[in-house]
Interface confidence: medium
């Protein structure tokens, strides 16, 4: 003969536990049925009648089987620095993340609660190692024989081009500048930009720093809004 | 699924103090509430108390109440009772237990996963 299925409410057996989507209720002391994702409990289980379950409100969720009393409250809207990449639903709270150029300096379980625009290098700093989604930008000065002559949030330090004949050498802010007989250079000209974070998880290749006879600097700088520090601007 | 691990039991005398704590993991700890349950020879499985992992709202049994304080690391998840002025009676074996979602509506109404338990003696 097949064992006999209990239905909701039962009082367990000593020392066993209830099912899977369903809780012991203290007061009752019983075996109880849990509300499903999108509901809660309008009314906790007794000794003869089961939990009753009512759906969540807008603006509120439940994102696991539960028998809480009211729904949880949706995060509130994103702000203009993020994007909504989870909507609010009776199953699942807002999710917001940053928008490109930007970085998640506090995050929460999902999702990101202050997001800060990521540090920019100024002339004469390279990239030392990209934003990601949750950690800023880290600039370096640029070593010798390198520049950066912008302010960006991509930008590497880049090889001076190798003059045959230097009209103006170069520093750590500008290119060198040749004569007119045609340069040759190590890298190919223009700017090197380096991946904008993204919102999904990927993986950033980084940099290969240069080699450097410049002090070891890391620029490592905090998290979070702070004033612009060497080598990176606010803007 | 959410495991749960107390630590910092032990023996001590009446009137001293003792903090247990209960390390947390597994997803959606967010959602959940932990509770304090203790277990004594001949008696039945008492609520001591609960705290909710989101609003940190907390919740005593009147026999620990101005006594026993419950409070939570969310970046550890971790959540501790710091017991004071300990009596017998408070002797039993002390179970962290989580709860989705808060514990506003009074003690525990149930629970979904039980840590093993630490030991707590208060005698002389």
């Known amino acids: 003969l097949p064992a006999q299925v209990a239905f909701t409410p039962y009082a367990p057996e000593p020392g066993s536990t209830c099912r899977l989507r369903e809780y012991y209720d203290q007061t009752a002391q019983m075996c109880c049925s849990k509300c499903s994702p999108g509901q809660h409990a309008k009314v906790f289980c007794t000794k003869t009648s089961d939990t009753v379950c009512d759906s969540c409100e807008d603006s509120t969720y439940t994102q696991l089987w539960n028998w809480v009393p009211e729904c949880l409250s949706c995060g509130s809207r994103c702000s203009s620095d993020q994007v909504e990449t989870q909507a609010c639903t009776r199953e699942q709270n807002r999710i917001c993340t940053c928008r490109p150029g930007w970085y998640c300096a506090l995050s929460k379980q999902e999702g990101c609660r202050l997001c800060a625009p990521l540090r920019k290098c100024r002339p004469g700093f390279g990239v030392a190692r990209p934003g990601t989604e949750t950690s800023d930008v880290v600039c370096k000065p640029c070593a010798p024989g390198t520049f950066s002559n912008t302010t960006s949030s991509t930008d590497i330090c880049r090889p001076h081009q190798i003059c045959n004949v230097v009209a103006i050498p170069g520093n750590a802010s500008m290119d060198a500048v040749c004569t007119s007989t045609s340069p040759t250079r190590s890298m190919a000209p223009g700017a090197v930009h380096l991946p904008q974070p993204v919102s999904t998880r990927s993986q950033h290749t980084q940099p290969t720093p240069e080699p450097s006879t410049a002090p070891s600097t890391s620029f490592l700088l905090p998290m979070g809004p702070s004033p612009p520090a060497e080598g990176s601007t606010g803007d | 699924e959410v495991q749960l691990v107390e630590s910092g039991g032990g023996l001590v005398q009446p009137g001293g103090s003792l903090t247990l704590s209960c390390a947390a993991s597994?997803?959606?700890?967010?959602?959940?509430?932990i509770g304090w349950f203790r277990e004594a020879p001949g008696k039945e499985r008492e609520g001591v108390s609960c705290?909710?992992?989101?609003?940190?709202?907390?919740n005593y049994a009147d026999s620990v109440k101005g006594r026993f304080t419950v409070s939570r690391d969310n970046a550890k998840n971790t959540v501790y009772l710091q017991m004071n002025s300990l009596k017998p009676e408070d002797t039993g074996v002390y179970h962290c237990?989580?709860?989705?979602?808060?514990?506003?509506?009074?003690?525990?109404?149930?629970?979904?996963?039980w840590g093993q338990g630490t030991q707590v003696t208060v005698s002389s």
């Open positions: 597994g997803r959606y700890l967010e959602y959940y509430a």
């Open positions: 237990a989580s709860e989705p979602y808060g514990c506003e509506d009074g003690l525990l109404r149930g629970y979904d996963y």
């Open positions: 705290i909710s992992m989101s609003a940190g709202s907390t």
